[in-house]
């Protein structure tokens, strides 16, 4: 380190270093002054600082602090932002794959249903995606709509292929019959339970990650108070007024100042800890019916089983529906 | 201006998005994220100390600055911060957090409540006997992994894992299935899912 300088009778040293922060020297006294107007760097004797210099030091100190805070949170911010994006994309891929599996199941097993089934399956998985992203859709309604839409096609194409092209009248009756007669057994209920549980958890998981980003962004862009600016100035820059360019703040002093400046931010700590621990609990519970990957990628199988269930009971169902929807069918045949 | 906003004072870690070679499920990826987040559990309480350790502080020097004068590093004066006559540090703490911080605390409280509600111990939700009318059903309880994968001819077996690989290899894409004559047929009735999601380290 350079040797300690001799006493500065001209403020030359202070002028020089102040230029690092502020081009031009009009604010720096030529020679030490009493400094009675100073509010932060209170002098014990003559000083080479002016009120204007103090203000510049305060501004720079606050900017320094903001940047230190942003640097401190950089790695954490990157971790959450990157993972939120990765999971959102991954969930979209799972939905897309689940849709493709379901369509492939229809294509392989029930080719006569495909054009319409593809449409209903597509609508269902679009709703699933929207729900995950926070849309105000009811999962039970989504599942009901899927089965309500599928049943008329199953009835007219698989169970009763002799019927003419379905008309709105019989379709409406069949949609109603689907629920009244529980034509798919308990499969729709099973799917509702599994899908709603897994999607709810997925949705809250993504919401939590996005809130994590918001928390970091909020604390990242905090504007520090004037009081804090004064404390930082005293710590980092007031020594310059005395020509002490190379001294560093005492460690304990720095901690006191930082605790004062960050008193508000530190209040987040309790809730941040709880946030991470609660998120961990949620993640630990995300398996089986609480894991959307597991549920959605297996959905085609459950839908297949539900159609098989209908086929197994086709005879009984056709008779019942024949009576129930007779009025609609008569109008259709006319 | 003389102030350089792009200068970060902390050694920037080189944060790379690496690609993993092994199969990785979403569930393992979630657990990995939690482990990394847990290393930041004290982030906010540790901030004051962290910032002091990343800004100039007298470590090996004999003398240090206490806000008013040059003092010996281990003297009592070093701990004193010369803030009297300026403003009260206790007062500064008493002011409480800024409105934006209070808002974010409220949001955290809310999400924590939701997360806790979702994480309640879960009993068995579904009755294994799904068919009230006594017909044989797909018998698929909520904890039977065999429910995934099929029954019946032509059923597709699913490799139930997402792989985070450099290439996206889709065996099947029936997004525009109606009227799409160029559909791929699942080879050997198996669909595997692959994707090129980077693994964050």
């Amino acid at each position: 380190q350079p040797p300690p300088p001799p006493p500065d009778a001209t403020c030359h040293q202070v002028r020089s270093f102040f230029q690092r922060l502020q081009p031009g020297l009009k604010w720096v006294p030529e020679t030490p002054v009493p400094g009675s107007d100073l509010q932060v760097c209170l002098p014990k004797g003559p000083t080479c600082c002016s009120r204007k210099m103090e203000e510049k030091y305060q501004l720079t100190a606050r900017l320094n602090m903001e940047q230190l805070l942003q640097s401190a949170s950089m790695e954490l911010k990157f971790l959450i932002i990157q993972n939120a994006a990765v999971f959102q994309e991954a969930f979209e891929i799972v939905v897309r794959h689940a849709k493709n599996y379901t369509n492939a199941m229809f294509k392989n097993n029930y080719p006569s249903l495909t054009p319409q089934a593809f449409e209903f399956v597509g609508e269902f998985f679009t709703d699933v995606s929207l729900y995950i992203l926070g849309s105000d859709i009811n999962v039970d309604d989504m599942v009901n709509e899927l089965f309500d839409s599928l049943f008329p096609v199953i009835y007219t194409q698989l169970m009763n292929p002799g019927l003419p092209d379905s008309a709105l009248d019989i379709n409406e009756c069949l949609r109603g019959a689907r629920r009244d007669l529980k034509v798919f057994g308990n499969f729709p209920k099973l799917i509702m339970t599994q899908v709603s549980k897994s999607l709810q958890v997925t949705r809250i998981f993504l919401q939590a990650l996005n809130l994590g980003i918001e928390v970091i962004n909020t604390t990242d862009h905090l504007k520090f108070s004037k009081d804090c600016g004064r404390m930082l100035t005293r710590m980092w820059y007031c020594s310059y007024c005395q020509g002490l360019m190379m001294v560093k703040p005492c460690g304990g002093y720095c901690n006191v100042v930082m605790q004062g400046c960050m008193a508000g931010v530190v209040e987040i700590d309790k809730y941040w800890r709880e946030y991470i621990l609660s998120l961990e609990e949620l993640v630990n519970g995300m398996y089986r019916i609480y894991d959307m990957e597991n549920v959605l990628l297996g959905l085609f199988s459950t839908i297949h089983d539900s159609i098989q269930y209908v086929q197994k009971n086709a005879g009984k169902l056709t008779t019942t529906i024949g009576k129930l929807c007779a009025h609609s069918q008569q109008r259709q045949y006319r | 201006s003389a102030y350089y906003p792009e200068d970060l004072f902390i050694d920037k870690k080189v944060l790379k998005v690496a690609h993993v070679e092994h199969e990785e499920t979403l569930s393992s990826r979630r657990r990995e994220l939690i482990q990394k987040l847990k290393s930041f559990i004290s982030f906010y309480s540790a901030l004051p100390g962290y910032i002091c350790s990343h800004s100039p502080v007298a470590e090996n020097d004999t003398l240090c600055w206490n806000g008013q004068e040059l003092v010996e590093r281990y003297s009592q004066k070093a701990a004193r911060n010369g803030m009297k006559n300026q403003f009260n540090l206790h007062e500064l703490k008493m002011k409480g957090p800024e409105p934006v911080v209070s808002q974010i605390i409220d949001k955290l409280k809310h999400i924590n409540q939701l997360l806790r509600t979702m994480s309640m111990p879960k009993g068995r939700v579904l009755d294994k006997n799904l068919d009230e009318e006594g017909f044989e059903s797909g018998d698929c309880g909520d904890d039977e992994d065999e429910c995934i994968g099929g029954s019946g001819d032509g059923m597709i077996k699913v490799k139930n894992q997402l792989r985070f690989l450099a290439e996206l290899a889709y065996d099947l894409d029936v997004d525009d299935a109606p009227g799409n004559s160029q559909q791929a047929t699942p080879k050997d009735n198996e669909i595997s899912t692959f994707h090129n999601l980077g693994n964050v380290h």
Epitope: R20, L63, N64, W236 | A2, Y3, Y4, D7, F9, P56
Partner: nanobody
Amino acid sequence: QVQLVESGGGLVQPGGSLRLSCAASGFTFSSFAMSWVRQAPGKGLEWVSAISGSGGRTHYADSVKGRFTISRDNSKNTLYLQMNSLRAEDTAVYYCAKEALTGVFDYWGQGTLVTVSS
């Protein structure tokens, strides 16, 4: 451990040129602004020039503006000061300094002496 080692000083005639180098180690060089500071015999410290971490911004004291050029090579972790049209009053020990915060220096080199004399 942060280390700054200056080199390139020497005796030069007025109007001549010199190029000072400062080899840095022990920290992520490109993340920090760097400065040159000098101390003339029997005088106080004088800040000479600063450069941002990326090298995109430079800043000079009025006394050297137009004559000195600060630069850095982040791939080599080296800071430079090209001094042209040297004058007798530029005679000093030149230190390179790492900036922890804007205008606040936490590490200094051991210095290299530049003597401008005929």
